[in-house]
């Protein structure tokens, strides 16, 4: 019952004499394991005996019996793993026919037939080509052989026109229940030159011997393959000559359909044949020619033919790299004169006069100068003649103003406060001068272009420079104005002593000034408006208070004189010329007020006074005025004072005070004798007690 069995294997196995066959086979039976397997050659069923008869090539029973003489047949499967693969090695032509696989299980029986085709000689492989081959389009060439056997090694090799193909082929072998084959695949980009060539696939044995082969002729579709020919042979022609160009189609598959011609990439109208003739060529017909031929694959373009029409140089023109050009810059001159062949010699002209030593198409002036300005023209020459000289090109050379100088217009010498006029001059300029600049910049008047008026010129306006300017400024050398001025910065400086001045000191004063022009100066010293000396230094060997006062120094030159700020010279000295004065006179009546004042001359002023009697006894009093109120006859006597400042002390001479009796006292005395006691026992005129009680500040 076929529904119980499922057996898979190739339908037909191919081989040749002496080779081998490998029959891949798998089975499945519903009731499980296979018990018996018999391989028949061309089995036939005997109806009478209800069994198959024929040559038994292999028999697998429970005891594993194999018919004698059939060692070349191997059952590679087994009855457990559903594998029924078998091989016959070697195989012979008479093995052709049917192989019968008799399979018996516990309950089921089956006969499976496999066709075996063994040829006398190795059969050829089959080359398979794609339906269309087109140049440069990659395809895969396939060589297929319906044979493969593990025991018999073979090789497939590709040849093109009998020579092995360089491309690497990939060989695939299949030994499956579906198919048995050996296949070689080759990736190949056919070129137009392969058209009509023979490709061979050779079958080789293990020793490299050719067993069989298959051949195909390549039909490679390609665009037309062209070459272009020119008659006469030269592509260099002279103006007026005739030229014929022929487009040769060396190969085309399929045949070409259209022809056209192009010059410099542009289609030439009404030129549709393989031959192009140009009659009496002109300069404009110089160019690159090619033919374009098309077929169904596409258009093809020939190589370009460069047709050169020779002619004498055309009227020239000069190209200048920059105009106007700046002086000192680099300028390139180029002679443009179309000619074929290119001119071999050039003649240059500057303002119509030939420039010597310049015979090139281009020349350069590295540092252009004003005299290089003018009209430049040129002539070009080639083998066909000398070209016409064109009108020329103008070169304008621009430069900053030249030889800029400055002139002082007013008479010299210049004095501080004068009005000075300066002019700025130059020799030449391109473009014209349009403004002027001045250094230093000041709030100065420019009454006209290039003229500067400095009013009330300063003492320190030492140098002025001007620039004449167009696109650039050119500076003149600065002009020293040499402004004359009276001495400046006149000051009194005390050299000695550096501290305060004391009477008797040596004193040095210096008259300083910061600048003077002219430099020759004279000095004058003044004290309280009176002239003291004419040296830069004023010296006092021993200064006295009488030298104090307001000092200033003057410095003069031929322009004028300048005074310093006044300085008050102060002389410090100890109190001097002390004297005691009495406002009421030196004779005072008793009972009145006696005021003694200590007059002094001191710098700084006296800060402390002392009073003494004729015995040089210090009186306990330190005021400037000694006041005796009421005064007594006993106060009569001589007094002196002493003054002190921070410099020192000074004292007065003695002054005598006489205190006389009042009329009342005299009257009482006449009435009453004066006793000895009245005079008192002391020699001191004024007692401590008296002073204490009677002196009032």
């Amino acid at each position: 019952d076929s529904s119980k069995w499922n057996i898979e294997h190739p339908g037909t196995i191919y081989a040749w004499e002496g080779a081998c066959v490998w029959v891949p086979c798998t089975y499945r039976v519903l009731d499980g394991a296979l018990e018996t397997f018999i391989l028949f050659h061309n089995p036939e069923y005997n109806q009478n005996m209800s069994k198959f008869e024929g040559t038994r090539l292999y028999e697998s029973t429970k005891d594993g019996k194999v018919p004698s003489g059939q060692k070349r047949v191997q059952f590679l499967g087994n009855k457990i793993n559903n594998n029924c693969t078998l091989s016959i090695h070697p195989v012979h032509v008479n093995d052709s026919g049917q192989l019968g696989l008799r399979m018996v299980s516990k309950t089921e029986k089956w006969m499976e037939r496999i066709h075996l085709n063994v040829s006398e000689r190795p059969f050829p492989p089959r080359i398979q080509l794609p339906p269309k081959l087109q140049e440069s389009q990659e395809v895969t060439l396939t060589c297929l052989l319906n044979f493969s056997c593990y025991g018999y090694q073979i090789q497939l090799q590709w040849l093109l026109e009998g020579a092995p193909m360089r491309q690497a082929a990939v060989t695939l072998t299949s030994l499956s229940t579906k198919s048995v084959f050996t296949r070689s695949e080759l990736k190949f980009s056919p070129q137009w030159s392969h058209h009509g060539k023979i490709v061979t696939c050779e079958l080789h044995d293990v020793d490299g011997k050719v067993l069989s082969e298959d051949m195909v002729q390549l039909n490679v579709k390609h665009t037309p393959k062209l070459t272009i020919e020119v008659t006469p042979n030269e592509t260099i022609v002279r103006k007026g000559d005739s030229v014929t160009m022929t487009c040769k189609v060396n190969s085309s598959n399929p045949e070409y359909t259209t022809v056209s011609w192009l010059k410099d990439g542009i289609l030439l109208k009404e030129q549709n044949t393989l031959m192009l003739t140009l009659h009496k060529v002109t300069k404009s017909q110089s160019g690159r020619y090619c033919c374009r031929v098309s077929n169904d694959v596409g258009p093809a373009t020939s190589e370009k033919v460069f047709l050169q029409v020779q002619y004498a140089p055309e009227p020239s023109r000069v190209q200048i790299s920059q105009s106007p050009a700046v002086e000192g810059s680099e300028v390139n001159f180029l002679c443009i004169s179309p000619a074929n062949p290119l001119p071999t010699n050039y003649t240059w002209y500057h303002n119509g006069k030939e420039v010597q030593g310049r015979t090139e198409k281009q020349f350069q002036i590295q540092k252009i100068l004003p005299w290089h300005a003018g009209t430049y023209s040129c002539e070009a020459e080639n083998i066909l003649g000398i070209g016409e000289r064109g009108p020329g090109t103008e070169l304008d050379v621009q430069y900053p103003p030249k030889k800029v100088t400055m002139v002082i217009e007013n008479p010299t010498p210049i004095r501080e406060g004068d009005t000075v006029t300066l002019s700025c001059n130059y020799s030449s300029s391109n473009p014209i001068v349009n403004h002027y600049e001045w250094r230093p910049r000041g709030a100065w008047e420019e009454p006209s272009l290039g003229v500067l008026k400095i009013q009330n010129i300063g003492w320190n306006n030492t140098a002025v420079a001007c620039a004449a300017c167009n696109n650039w400024c050119s500076w003149a050398s600065p002009v020293t104005l040499n402004v004359l001025y009276a001495p400046r910065g006149v000051r009194v400086r005390k050299i000695k002593p550096l501290s305060e001045i004391h009477s008797g000191n040596s004193v040095s004063l210096q008259c300083d000034f910061s600048s003077s022009h002219p430099k020759e100066v004279q000095f004058f010293w003044e004290k309280n408006g009176s002239l003291l000396g004419k040296e830069s230094q004023l010296n006092f060997d021993s200064i006295s208070p009488e030298d104090a006062g307001s000092y200033s120094c003057w410095v003069n030159n031929s322009i004028g004189q300048t005074a310093s700020k006044a300085w008050t010279l102060e002389v410090l000295y100890a109190p001097r010329r002390l004297r005691v004065s009495m406002s009421q006179g030196n004779q005072v009546m008793e009972g009145k007020t006696a005021t003694l004042t200590c007059e002094s001359d001191a710098n700084p002023p006296v800060y402390s006074y002392a009073w003494f009697d004729w015995n040089n006894q210090s009186l306990p009093y330190s005021g400037r005025m000694l006041r005796l109120e009421p005064v007594k006859v006993q106060h009569s006597g001589a007094y002196w004072c002493q003054g002190t400042n921070r410099v020192g002390k000074g004292h007065s001479p003695l002054i005598t005070l006489t205190v006389y009796y009042s009329p009342q006292t005299i009257g009482r005395r006449e009435q009453k004798l004066i006793s000895e006691e009245d005079l008192g026992g002391e020699q001191k005129l004024i007692s401590e007690e008296d002073l204490h009680h009677h002196h009032h500040h």
Epitope: R491, V492, R493, K494, S499, A566
Partner: antibody, heavy 125, light 108 residues
């Protein structure tokens, strides 16, 4: 331009003697006092003394009296500061400066201007 | 001798700020005989002010001095990057002439 140019740096050993100089230019050297000022490393300024090149009158700061000698030679516009026996504590920068000034009103001002760039004296055993 | 005391010892400020430096004398400085100097690292001092308030030649007007007697001030109205330095006051009214110990003005 008024300028004071001082002599170069000195490296000395304790006990050695040294004389550094200060040269004036651009003014009448004889008529201006020259001051010497000490600046010890990382410290402030100390006036050492002053000299009047015109007659070489010198005034010392009491702290420096007897430690140094200040002198001048007006013929070559030079002022000098010298030590007879250096000590490590004399390591300092020494500046000379011109004593400028002017009088007006009742005042007489003085100042140090300009200054020399200084002379570095290093005393080390 | 007159001792001059400067304060503060160090002043940390930013450019553009106002700097006020003080100099106090141990006794009255006669006739405002006081000068101010600037010293930058590795350089000699430079005179800024004399007579307590008179600017020396070439000194920018952002520097000003004031004071009399025993209290004096140097003011920098708007600090420029080049003003960061040490500043010394000095009296020349009494012998020996003396300097303050200095005030360092540094960038904050």
């Amino acid at each position: 331009e008024v300028q004071l140019v001082q002599s170069g740096a000195e490296v000395k050993k304790p006990g050695e003697s040294l004389k550094i100089s200060c040269k004036g230019s651009g003014y009448n050297f004889a008529t201006y006092w020259i001051a010497w000022v000490r600046q010890m490393p990382g410290k402030g300024l100390e006036l050492m003394g002053i000299i009047y090149p015109g007659d070489s009158e010198t005034t010392y700061n009491p702290s420096f009296q007897g430690q140094v000698t200040i002198s001048a030679d007006k013929s070559i516009s030079n002022a000098y500061l010298q030590w007879s026996s250096l000590k490590a504590s004399d390591t300092a920068m020494y500046y000379c400066a011109r004593v400028g000034g002017y009088c007006s009103g009742t005042s007489c001002h003085n100042w140090f201007d300009p200054w020399g760039l200084g002379t570095l004296v290093t005393v080390s055993s | 001798e007159i001792v001059l005391t400067q304060s503060p010892g160090t002043l940390s400020l930013s450019p553009g700020e106002r700097a006020t430096l003080s100099c106090r004398a141990s006794q009255s400085v006669s006739s405002s005989y006081l000068a101010w100097y600037q010293q930058k690292p590795g350089q000699a001092p430079r005179l800024l002010i004399y007579g307590a308030s008179s600017r020396a030649t070439g000194i920018p007007d952002r520097f000003s001095g004031s004071g009399s007697g025993t209290d004096f001030t140097l003011t920098i109205s708007r600090l420029e990057p080049e003003d960061f330095a040490v500043y010394y006051c000095q009296q020349y009214g009494s012998s020996p002439w003396t300097f303050g110990q200095g005030t360092k003005v540094e960038i904050k």
